[in-house]
């Protein structure tokens, strides 16, 4: 039994003090308008469906419906006393998408459809989303609409981010198989694409896939191995979406950045973070890049987004995602360097300039300071007990460094008898010496390693 307090107010005239379910009349198995409580709130009755009359003797509206008099005031005891009939109107007025893939004008219509479905012993129709099927719910006042500035940036730049795949031919069957992939971004409407040099090589077929799934054969236009930047070109009819280069020199530590790539067909990978350091000396990071500064970020850079753009919140490219050192430390080639490369590339192709050779051993490194050593020690328990030297971030395969036996996480502490305090010291020795007899701290043991630099085109 329900006490009067448990019932909806106001009470209709002639309601009992206590509800007695036994006195409730039997109800049909199915109600077109759904079930509702009677005027006293005691018995479950069939509610009037949407659009049916309510109030007076007509009884209550079904679930989710309210009784509204013609001029729009919800029916109440006052209305009833005035002896005016109302209409059952859905309390919710926005469209909804049902699990049957149909769009309903409101929630009540979906519920009615669900009841019909169950009557036919079919599955009930449930609400999949607010708004029509096949379209997102755009509520400009929702928090996610107002504050998802990262998603806004991604939406803006994604069409210009491409997936790059390299193929080789098997020696006898001549079948083409994929050998590597990465990302890139379009910088000109006629199909010039920037990526990392390590993503592409001249001897392989390079295939580019756009966001819309269209694929193209790409030609390698220019490569700067030292800076790890490559320019490739696709032939496309019509204008392509492009990304504009921002000024990396104006970046501030703490600024939001978004790293985006296209590791798989038709998919983007997005990571976000802040700028940790705007001018990490390139000599500290790698000999290919000894005259260049890097942007350090905590946005995750990995194989998936390598070669893709690092953008600011205006969607301008402020770097090329290039390498990850360890969790939370990643690097990007600054956009000012990309601009320089594109300008020089234009000049080179116009004039066919000769390029001088550089010495190279194939490592990326950074100067070890006591604070950086502490940071690395916190991340890796077995990190060597050293507070200065050149810390090896990466050993590039098939290079003198790898051949000599250098490994990731080694710390170079001396070369040819001279102590190494920073990565610059290593860069300087490479320029001068043809053989490098290194003492390397690996874990807590000192190892002798010989590396013979090779000459490469910059």
């Amino acid at each position: 039994q329900l006490s009067r307090a448990g019932r909806s107010a106001p009470l209709a005239a002639g309601c009992p003090d206590r509800c007695e379910p036994a006195r409730c009349p039997p109800q049909p198995e199915h109600c077109e308008g759904g079930r509702a409580r009677d005027a006293c709130g005691c018995c479950e009755v069939c509610g009037a469906p949407e659009g049916a009359a309510c109030g007076l003797q007509e009884g209550p509206c079904g679930e989710g419906l309210q009784c509204v008099v013609p001029f729009g005031v919800p029916a109440s005891a006052t209305v009833r006393r005035r002896a005016q009939a109302g209409l059952c109107v859905c309390a919710s007025s926005e469209p909804v998408c049902g699990s049957d893939a149909n769009t309903y004008a409101n929630l009540c219509q979906l519920r009615a459809a669900s009841r019909r479905s169950e009557r036919l012993h079919r599955p009930p129709v449930i609400v999949l989303q607010r708004g029509a099927c096949g379209q997102g719910q755009e509520d400009p006042n929702s928090l996610r609409h107002k504050y998802n500035f990262i998603a806004d940036v991604v939406e803006k730049i994604a069409p210009a981010v491409v997936h790059i795949e390299l193929f080789r031919k098997l020696p006898f069957s001549k079948r083409e198989v994929p050998v590597a992939s990465g990302s890139g971004f379009i910088v000109s409407e006629d199909g010039l694409i920037v990526t990392n040099a390590h993503v592409v090589t001249n001897k392989h077929r390079v295939k580019v896939e756009l966001k819309n799934g269209a694929t193209y054969e790409a030609k390698i236009k220019d490569v700067d191995e030292k800076a790890d930047i490559a320019l490739i070109k696709i032939d496309h009819q019509g204008k392509l979406p492009v990304l504009l280069l921002g000024r990396s020199s104006e970046l501030r530590p703490g600024e939001f950045v978004v790293a985006i790539g296209s590791p798989f067909s038709l998919q983007n990978t997005v990571t976000t973070g802040i700028v940790s350091t705007t001018q990490r000396g390139g000599k500290e990071l790698g000999l290919r890049n000894s005259d260049m500064d890097y942007i350090q970020t905590d946005a995750i850079i990995n194989y998936g987004n390598s070669g893709g753009p690092l953008v600011n919140l205006d969607g301008e490219v402020i770097g090329i995602n290039t390498l990850k050192v360890t969790a939370g430390i990643s690097f990007a080639i600054p956009s000012d360097k990309i601009k320089k490369f594109l300008t020089e590339s234009h000049d080179r192709q116009a004039k066919g300039k000769a390029i001088t050779k550089k010495k190279y051993i194939g490592i990326r490194m950074m100067s070890l300071t006591s604070s950086k050593a502490k940071e690395l020690k916190d991340r890796h328990r077995d990190f060597p007990d050293v507070i200065s030297g050149a810390y090896i971030i990466e050993v590039i395969p098939d290079t003198p460094a790898e051949a000599g036996g250098l490994k990731e996480n080694d710390v170079i502490i001396s070369i040819n008898g001279q102590s190494v305090v920073s990565a610059n010291d290593v860069s300087d020795v490479i320029k001068r010496e043809s053989t490098l007899n290194m003492v390397v701290r690996r874990g807590n043991e000192d190892i002798m390693i010989t590396v013979i630099p090779e000459e490469i085109d910059p």
Epitope: P171, F172, R175, P178, V179, H204, P397
Partner: antibody
Amino acid sequence: QVQLQQSGAELVRPGASVKLSCKASGYTFTDYEMHWVKQTPVHGLEWIGAIDPETGGTAYNQKFKGKATLTADKSSSTAYMELRSLTSEDSAVYYCTREGYSYDGGGYYFDYWGQGTTLTVSS
Amino acid sequence: QIVLTQSPAIMSASPGEKVTMTCSVSSSVSYMYWYQQKPGSSPRLLIYDTSNLASGVPVRFSGSGSGTSYSLTISRMEAEDAATYYCQQWSSYPTFGGGTKLEIK
């Protein structure tokens, strides 16, 4: 890491056939051709042939056509070489070896080798 | 077929000594490959594309040459370098040299 595990040593009668196996692991089996090489003290290392595991396409050294048949099973990442009408000349160590390539686009070579299967043909 | 002739067939060297072996080709090839094989073991790739060291190979090994003449050099012989060395080319199909057996003095 890449591994090629070959079947054990075989002692067979002249005139018989034998099927050697090579199970690959640590890489995508269908992305590389599998090759077979014969080694004897007299003739040294000799290339027998190759198979593309994806298509089953084969290439043979003219010298071994009719002697060797190469097959591959993608589901088990295993390459096979059947040698028929065996004679004492077929006694050798047989290696399966994966075709390698230079990322910078040089030529082809053999970057990983099985441990070898010793075949002895004797009555 | 392209024939590779290695010389010498057998040689010996003292620890620390420089060692050079050659591979002569019957007609010009673009690249040469070198393998090391120790008794009871499979061949191991040492040098690819004439002069590139394979992963894990000590820098004392180096390769050079072009056309029909190629060589493998060990700058300072070590006891563990005692093995048989094979050159290999791959034009229409792969062929190997007869090998150079290197012994330690």
